[in-house]
């Protein structure tokens, strides 16, 4: 698995560099997670033909994966820093159950899947420090998450492959939109 941000050889070799700001740390953390997703997608795409399926075909699924919408304040039209930050944190918390599902879905990239999960937890902590309105953030219900996880794991092989692909793609898109909005803050 790749080394978490702040622990790569470049950082060790440059001890006199300015410490990263909170925004730079968040930016680097998201890019690190995106690299991890990219590696996981590679294994998924090599294993099945899900990646060839059209977006329209894949949209027909029962997964309630977090997605950015206009009302969330993360796009240029209607951009709202506080509303957007709440959406990003809420969305990441909602993704956690899906990242847990991914943990047993990879053979050669098992460590990478764990790294994505753990790095997301760290990212949530970074973002919570940045948010002023933590009361607006709703945490998913653990019981609901547990039953969702059981349901996902009980699917047949084809559906599990499809679910894995959809989670990775949706998580990537959510992170991309989040990072673009964070770069405006």
């Amino acid at each position: 698995a790749p080394v978490p941000p702040g622990e790569d050889s470049k950082d060790v070799a440059a001890p006199h560099r300015q410490p990263l700001t909170s925004s730079e740390r968040i930016d680097k953390q998201i890019r690190y997670i995106l690299d991890g997703i990219s590696a996981l997608r590679k294994e998924t795409c090599n294993k099945s033909n899900m990646c060839e399926s059209s977006k329209e075909a894949l949209a027909e699924n029962n997964l309630n994966l977090p997605k950015m919408a206009e009302k969330d304040g993360c796009f240029q039209s209607g951009f709202n820093e506080e509303t957007c930050l709440v959406k990003i944190i809420t969305g990441l918390l909602e993704f956690e159950v899906y990242l847990e599902y991914l943990q047993n879905r990879f053979e050669s990239s098992e460590e990478q899947a764990r790294a994505v999960q753990m790095s997301t937890k760290v990212l949530i902590q970074f973002l919570q420090k940045k948010a002023k309105n933590l009361d607006a953030i709703t945490t998913p219900d653990p019981t609901t998450n547990a039953s969702l996880l059981t349901k996902l794991q009980a699917q047949n092989q084809w559906l599990q492959d499809m679910t894995t692909h959809l989670i990775l793609r949706s998580f990537k898109e959510f992170l991309q939109s989040s990072l673009r909005a964070l770069r405006q803050m």
Epitope: L34, F75, E173, Q176, S177, R183
Partner: nanobody, 124 residues
Framework: EVQLVESGGGLVQPGGSLQLSCTTS????????VGWFRQGPGKEREFVAD????????WYAESVLGRFTISRDDAKNTVYLQMDSLKPEDTAVYYC?????????????????WGQGTQVTVSS
């Protein structure tokens, strides 16, 4: 990194239109975010617009909002900048840049590949 080539620049009268293109032969260009920047005579290079891997995620500089439109055609490995209601102050060399993370942003440091630029002159 991807090799980027801009085209479509030229001389146009105030109020006129131009469409710039940013093309690459890179296989995975659809996964890149692409930004347009410009550098006017004696000025710093500045952000104009960008488009994410998800084409609906577009951002514009305040100075071009409502006049310029960024779009992408992944089948052609091309990103377009449609420039309408051009003003003399839009005169600049326009550069396109690519971000392998598919995110983009309004600062040059977010991009890892750059084109050579295309000249746009707005004058009567």
């Amino acid at each position: 990194e991807v090799q980027l080539v801009e085209s479509g620049g030229g001389l146009v009268q105030p109020g006129g239109s131009l469409q710039l293109s940013c093309t690459t032969s890179g296989r995975r260009f659809s996964e890149y975010a692409v930004g347009w920047f410009r550098q006017g005579p004696g000025k710093e290079r500045e952000f104009v617009a960008d488009i994410g891997e998800q084409a609906e995620n577009t951002w514009y500089a305040e100075s071009v909002l409502g006049r310029f439109t960024i779009s992408r055609d992944d089948a052609k490995n091309t990103v377009y900048l449609q420039m309408d209601s051009l003003k003399p102050e839009d005169t600049a060399v326009y550069y396109c840049a690519a971000d392998k993370y598919g995110v983009g942003g309004n600062a040059q440091g977010y991009y890892d590949s750059w084109g050579q630029g295309t000249q746009v002159t707005v004058s009567s």
